[in-house]
Protein backbone atom coordinates (compact mmCIF):
# COMPACT_ATOMS: atom_id res chain seq x y z
CA UNK A 1 0.00 0.00 0.00
CA UNK A 2 2.71 1.96 1.04
CA UNK A 3 4.64 1.73 -2.37
CA UNK A 4 1.98 2.05 -4.22
CA UNK A 5 1.48 5.96 -2.83
CA UNK A 6 4.93 6.75 -3.34
CA UNK A 7 4.43 5.80 -6.98
CA UNK A 8 1.46 7.85 -7.37
CA UNK A 9 3.36 10.96 -5.38
CA UNK A 10 6.23 9.91 -7.78
CA UNK A 11 4.15 10.06 -10.91
CA UNK A 12 2.26 13.30 -9.48
CA UNK A 13 5.78 15.37 -8.94
CA UNK A 14 6.69 14.27 -12.69
CA UNK A 15 3.77 15.27 -13.99
CA UNK A 16 4.31 18.55 -11.69
CA UNK A 17 7.84 18.90 -13.50
CA UNK A 18 6.35 18.86 -17.06
CA UNK A 19 3.73 21.14 -16.29
CA UNK A 20 6.73 23.41 -15.28
CA UNK A 21 8.77 23.17 -17.50
CA UNK A 22 5.60 23.51 -20.17
CA UNK A 23 4.81 26.81 -18.36
CA UNK A 24 8.35 27.72 -18.94
CA UNK A 25 8.51 27.12 -22.37
CA UNK A 26 5.11 28.90 -22.79
CA UNK A 27 6.55 32.16 -20.95
CA UNK A 28 9.52 31.99 -22.63
CA UNK A 29 7.69 31.71 -26.28
CA UNK A 30 5.27 34.66 -25.20
CA UNK A 31 8.28 36.96 -23.93
CA UNK A 32 9.34 36.09 -27.66
CA UNK A 33 6.27 36.89 -29.38
CA UNK A 34 5.99 40.51 -26.91
CA UNK A 35 9.54 41.52 -28.01
CA UNK A 36 8.85 40.00 -31.71
CA UNK A 37 5.18 42.48 -31.47
CA UNK A 38 7.53 45.76 -30.28
CA UNK A 39 10.24 45.06 -32.80
CA UNK A 40 7.42 44.77 -35.78
CA UNK A 41 5.88 48.25 -34.15
CA UNK A 42 9.02 49.90 -34.32
CA UNK A 43 10.29 48.64 -37.62
CA UNK A 44 7.02 50.14 -39.28
CA UNK A 45 7.63 53.35 -37.82
CA UNK A 46 11.00 53.90 -38.86
CA UNK A 47 13.26 51.99 -41.33
CA UNK A 48 15.66 48.89 -40.30
CA UNK A 49 18.34 50.22 -40.34
CA UNK A 50 17.08 52.41 -37.03
CA UNK A 51 15.28 49.56 -35.81
CA UNK A 52 18.65 47.49 -35.50
CA UNK A 53 20.76 50.45 -34.35
CA UNK A 54 17.73 50.99 -31.11
CA UNK A 55 18.65 54.28 -31.14
CA UNK A 56 15.47 56.35 -31.52
CA UNK A 57 17.08 57.98 -34.24
CA UNK A 58 19.03 56.97 -37.30
CA UNK A 59 22.77 58.36 -37.72
CA UNK A 60 22.83 61.89 -38.80
CA UNK A 61 19.38 62.52 -37.83
CA UNK A 62 18.68 64.77 -35.14
CA UNK A 63 16.32 64.15 -31.78
CA UNK A 64 13.91 66.66 -30.16
CA UNK A 65 10.89 64.90 -28.30
CA UNK A 66 9.17 62.50 -30.35
CA UNK A 67 10.85 63.68 -33.72
CA UNK A 68 13.63 63.22 -35.82
CA UNK A 69 15.21 65.50 -38.13
CA UNK A 70 17.88 65.30 -40.90
CA UNK A 71 19.57 68.48 -42.49
CA UNK A 72 20.26 68.17 -45.99
CA UNK A 73 23.61 68.62 -47.38
CA UNK A 74 22.36 69.10 -51.06
CA UNK A 75 20.19 71.54 -52.50
CA UNK A 76 17.35 70.56 -54.34
CA UNK A 77 13.90 72.37 -55.48
CA UNK A 78 10.87 71.98 -53.04
CA UNK A 79 9.69 68.79 -54.76
CA UNK A 80 12.33 67.22 -54.89
CA UNK A 81 13.14 67.79 -51.50
CA UNK A 82 9.81 65.88 -50.28
CA UNK A 83 10.87 62.91 -52.76
CA UNK A 84 13.92 62.85 -50.78
CA UNK A 85 12.39 63.10 -47.26
CA UNK A 86 10.25 60.07 -48.67
CA UNK A 87 12.73 57.89 -49.83
CA UNK A 88 14.79 58.33 -45.98
CA UNK A 89 10.93 57.35 -45.01
CA UNK A 90 10.14 61.04 -43.79
CA UNK A 91 8.59 64.06 -45.05
CA UNK A 92 9.30 67.41 -45.06
CA UNK A 93 9.72 69.07 -41.70
CA UNK A 94 6.06 70.55 -39.94
CA UNK A 95 6.74 73.11 -37.33
CA UNK A 96 4.00 72.66 -34.80
CA UNK A 97 5.06 75.12 -32.03
CA UNK A 98 7.00 78.20 -31.25
CA UNK A 99 9.03 75.56 -29.25
CA UNK A 100 10.11 73.34 -32.32
CA UNK A 101 10.62 76.91 -34.03
CA UNK A 102 13.30 77.68 -31.65
CA UNK A 103 14.67 74.04 -31.29
CA UNK A 104 15.48 73.51 -35.19
CA UNK A 105 17.21 77.21 -35.73
CA UNK A 106 18.89 77.07 -32.91
CA UNK A 107 20.62 73.58 -34.66
CA UNK A 108 20.83 75.08 -37.89
CA UNK A 109 22.62 77.73 -36.33
CA UNK A 110 24.95 75.27 -34.98
CA UNK A 111 25.15 73.29 -37.91
CA UNK A 112 25.86 75.48 -40.89
CA UNK A 113 24.54 79.15 -39.97
CA UNK A 114 22.50 80.98 -42.14
CA UNK A 115 21.21 79.45 -45.40
CA UNK A 116 17.59 78.64 -46.62
CA UNK A 117 15.83 75.28 -45.81
CA UNK A 118 12.88 73.91 -47.22
CA UNK A 119 9.72 72.95 -45.09
CA UNK A 120 6.63 71.12 -45.80
CA UNK A 121 4.34 74.95 -46.08
CA UNK A 122 2.90 75.76 -49.34
CA UNK A 123 0.34 78.37 -50.09
CA UNK A 124 -2.64 77.16 -52.68
CA UNK A 125 -2.62 78.82 -55.62
CA UNK A 126 -6.35 79.29 -55.33
CA UNK A 127 -7.71 80.09 -51.70
CA UNK A 128 -3.71 82.07 -50.94
CA UNK A 129 -3.72 79.97 -47.77
CA UNK A 130 -0.93 78.72 -46.45
CA UNK A 131 -1.19 74.79 -45.32
CA UNK A 132 1.43 72.09 -44.08
CA UNK A 133 1.77 69.07 -46.31
CA UNK A 134 -0.67 67.09 -44.31
CA UNK A 135 -3.47 69.46 -44.65
CA UNK A 136 -3.43 71.19 -41.15
CA UNK A 137 -3.23 75.03 -40.83
CA UNK A 138 -0.09 76.52 -39.38
CA UNK A 139 -0.74 78.27 -36.07
CA UNK A 140 -0.90 82.16 -36.36
CA UNK A 141 2.43 82.76 -35.22
CA UNK A 142 4.24 80.36 -37.90
CA UNK A 143 2.83 82.27 -41.03
CA UNK A 144 5.77 82.97 -43.13
CA UNK A 145 6.64 86.92 -43.74
CA UNK A 146 4.81 87.60 -47.37
CA UNK A 147 8.22 87.96 -49.43
CA UNK A 148 7.74 86.39 -52.15
CA UNK A 149 5.94 87.81 -55.20
CA UNK A 150 6.04 85.06 -57.59
CA UNK A 151 3.27 84.14 -60.20
CA UNK A 152 4.63 80.59 -59.95
CA UNK A 153 3.60 78.13 -56.86
CA UNK A 154 5.13 79.80 -53.42
CA UNK A 155 6.52 77.51 -50.37
CA UNK A 156 7.76 77.85 -46.97
CA UNK A 157 11.61 77.96 -45.81
CA UNK A 158 13.22 78.42 -42.60
CA UNK A 159 15.84 81.15 -42.85
CA UNK A 160 18.24 81.91 -39.70
CA UNK A 161 15.20 82.34 -37.33
CA UNK A 162 12.59 83.29 -39.62
CA UNK A 163 9.79 81.37 -41.65
CA UNK A 164 9.88 83.05 -45.25
CA UNK A 165 8.17 82.68 -48.93
CA UNK A 166 9.82 81.70 -52.06
CA UNK A 167 8.94 80.28 -55.62
CA UNK A 168 9.03 76.39 -55.12
CA UNK A 169 11.03 75.95 -58.04
CA UNK A 170 14.17 78.18 -56.24
CA UNK A 171 17.24 75.81 -54.67
CA UNK A 172 17.67 75.36 -51.14
CA UNK A 173 18.72 72.89 -48.46
CA UNK A 174 15.99 71.29 -46.87
CA UNK A 175 15.26 69.68 -43.60
CA UNK A 176 13.04 66.36 -42.96
CA UNK A 177 11.16 65.14 -40.07
CA UNK A 178 10.00 61.45 -38.96
CA UNK A 179 8.30 60.14 -35.70
CA UNK A 180 11.16 58.98 -33.25
CA UNK A 181 11.29 55.88 -32.14
CA UNK A 182 9.25 54.71 -29.03
CA UNK A 183 11.73 53.26 -26.54
CA UNK A 184 10.07 49.56 -25.52
CA UNK A 185 11.04 50.53 -21.94
CA UNK B 1 12.85 43.81 -55.90
CA UNK B 2 9.61 45.33 -55.16
CA UNK B 3 5.90 44.62 -57.33
CA UNK B 4 3.00 47.03 -57.14
CA UNK B 5 -0.60 46.29 -58.10
CA UNK B 6 -3.05 49.20 -58.38
CA UNK B 7 -6.88 48.80 -58.74
CA UNK B 8 -9.99 50.75 -57.79
CA UNK B 9 -10.21 53.27 -60.85
CA UNK B 10 -12.97 53.84 -62.62
CA UNK B 11 -15.31 56.41 -64.11
CA UNK B 12 -17.17 58.37 -61.83
CA UNK B 13 -19.32 61.64 -61.88
CA UNK B 14 -18.08 64.74 -60.48
CA UNK B 15 -18.95 65.42 -56.71
CA UNK B 16 -18.21 61.65 -56.68
CA UNK B 17 -16.03 59.16 -54.76
CA UNK B 18 -13.15 56.15 -55.74
CA UNK B 19 -11.09 54.15 -53.34
CA UNK B 20 -8.00 53.20 -54.95
CA UNK B 21 -5.55 50.63 -53.57
CA UNK B 22 -2.09 49.68 -54.17
CA UNK B 23 -0.91 46.34 -53.60
CA UNK B 24 3.14 45.52 -52.76
CA UNK B 25 4.52 42.24 -52.74
CA UNK B 26 8.66 41.15 -53.01
CA UNK B 27 10.96 43.00 -50.57
CA UNK B 28 8.55 45.13 -48.99
CA UNK B 29 11.17 45.26 -45.97
CA UNK B 30 13.01 47.93 -47.91
CA UNK B 31 10.13 50.23 -48.38
CA UNK B 32 9.97 53.18 -46.51
CA UNK B 33 6.88 55.39 -47.91
CA UNK B 34 4.15 54.90 -50.84
CA UNK B 35 2.84 57.21 -52.61
CA UNK B 36 0.39 58.06 -55.40
CA UNK B 37 1.19 60.26 -58.88
CA UNK B 38 -0.56 61.63 -61.53
CA UNK B 39 1.00 63.41 -64.97
CA UNK B 40 0.84 66.79 -64.27
CA UNK B 41 2.07 69.80 -66.83
CA UNK B 42 4.37 68.33 -69.51
CA UNK B 43 4.15 64.69 -68.82
CA UNK B 44 5.75 64.79 -65.63
CA UNK B 45 4.32 63.09 -62.64
CA UNK B 46 3.31 65.07 -59.73
CA UNK B 47 3.14 63.21 -56.31
CA UNK B 48 -0.37 63.54 -54.83
CA UNK B 49 -0.07 62.01 -51.84
CA UNK B 50 1.85 60.12 -50.20
CA UNK B 51 2.59 58.35 -46.68
CA UNK B 52 5.60 56.85 -44.53
CA UNK B 53 6.05 53.94 -42.92
CA UNK B 54 5.57 55.83 -39.48
CA UNK B 55 2.19 57.45 -41.02
CA UNK B 56 3.47 60.68 -41.85
CA UNK B 57 1.71 62.11 -44.51
CA UNK B 58 1.93 64.76 -47.55
CA UNK B 59 -0.33 66.13 -50.25
CA UNK B 60 -0.38 68.15 -53.08
CA UNK B 61 -2.59 71.34 -52.46
CA UNK B 62 -4.84 70.80 -55.11
CA UNK B 63 -5.95 67.54 -53.04
CA UNK B 64 -6.13 68.84 -49.67
CA UNK B 65 -9.02 68.21 -47.65
CA UNK B 66 -10.99 65.84 -50.27
CA UNK B 67 -8.18 63.06 -50.56
CA UNK B 68 -7.00 60.79 -47.69
CA UNK B 69 -3.81 58.65 -48.22
CA UNK B 70 -3.97 55.56 -45.71
CA UNK B 71 -2.39 51.94 -45.07
CA UNK B 72 -3.37 48.77 -44.06
CA UNK B 73 0.28 47.08 -42.85
CA UNK B 74 -0.99 43.75 -42.81
CA UNK B 75 -2.38 43.54 -46.18
CA UNK B 76 1.10 45.61 -47.45
CA UNK B 77 -1.58 48.11 -49.32
CA UNK B 78 -2.06 51.16 -49.85
CA UNK B 79 -5.00 53.71 -50.46
CA UNK B 80 -6.17 56.90 -51.75
CA UNK B 81 -9.73 57.94 -51.03
CA UNK B 82 -10.75 60.42 -53.61
CA UNK B 83 -13.97 62.30 -52.41
CA UNK B 84 -15.79 65.40 -54.32
CA UNK B 85 -14.17 64.26 -57.20
CA UNK B 86 -13.31 67.28 -60.01
CA UNK B 87 -13.11 66.91 -64.05
CA UNK B 88 -9.30 67.86 -63.49
CA UNK B 89 -8.64 64.79 -61.42
CA UNK B 90 -9.22 62.97 -64.69
CA UNK B 91 -5.42 61.10 -65.11
CA UNK B 92 -3.98 57.74 -64.62
CA UNK B 93 -2.74 57.09 -60.88
CA UNK B 94 0.49 55.59 -60.57
CA UNK B 95 1.17 53.96 -57.21
CA UNK B 96 5.29 54.38 -56.42
CA UNK B 97 6.93 52.66 -53.53
CA UNK B 98 9.82 54.71 -52.26
CA UNK B 99 13.34 52.70 -50.78
CA UNK B 100 16.25 54.53 -50.11
CA UNK B 101 18.02 53.37 -53.04
CA UNK B 102 15.42 52.87 -55.89
CA UNK B 103 11.65 53.81 -56.67
CA UNK B 104 8.91 51.29 -58.09
CA UNK B 105 6.20 52.21 -59.98
CA UNK B 106 2.68 50.03 -60.72
CA UNK B 107 1.31 50.55 -64.13
CA UNK B 108 -1.14 52.85 -63.04
CA UNK B 109 -5.08 52.53 -63.10
CA UNK B 110 -7.09 55.13 -64.67
CA UNK B 111 -9.46 57.70 -63.33
CA UNK B 112 -12.00 59.64 -65.40
CA UNK B 113 -14.62 62.34 -63.98
CA UNK B 114 -17.08 63.43 -66.09
CA UNK B 115 -19.14 66.69 -65.65
Known amino acids: KLLQVSTIAMQQQEKLIQQERALLNFTEWKRSCALQMKYCQAFMQNSLSSAHNSSPCPNNWIQNRESCYYVSEIWSIWHTSQENCLKEGSTLLQIESKEEMDFITGSLRKIKGSYDYWVGLSQDGHSGRWLWQDGSSPSPGLLPAERSQSANQVCGYVKSNSLLSSNCSTWKYFICEKYALRSSV | QVQLQESGGGLVQAGGSLRLSCAATGDISSINAMGWHRPARGNERELVAAITNGGRTTYVDSVKGRFTISRDNAKNTVYLQMNSLKPEDTAVYFC?????????WGQGTQVTVSS
Open chain 2, 96 to 104: KAYTRDEDY
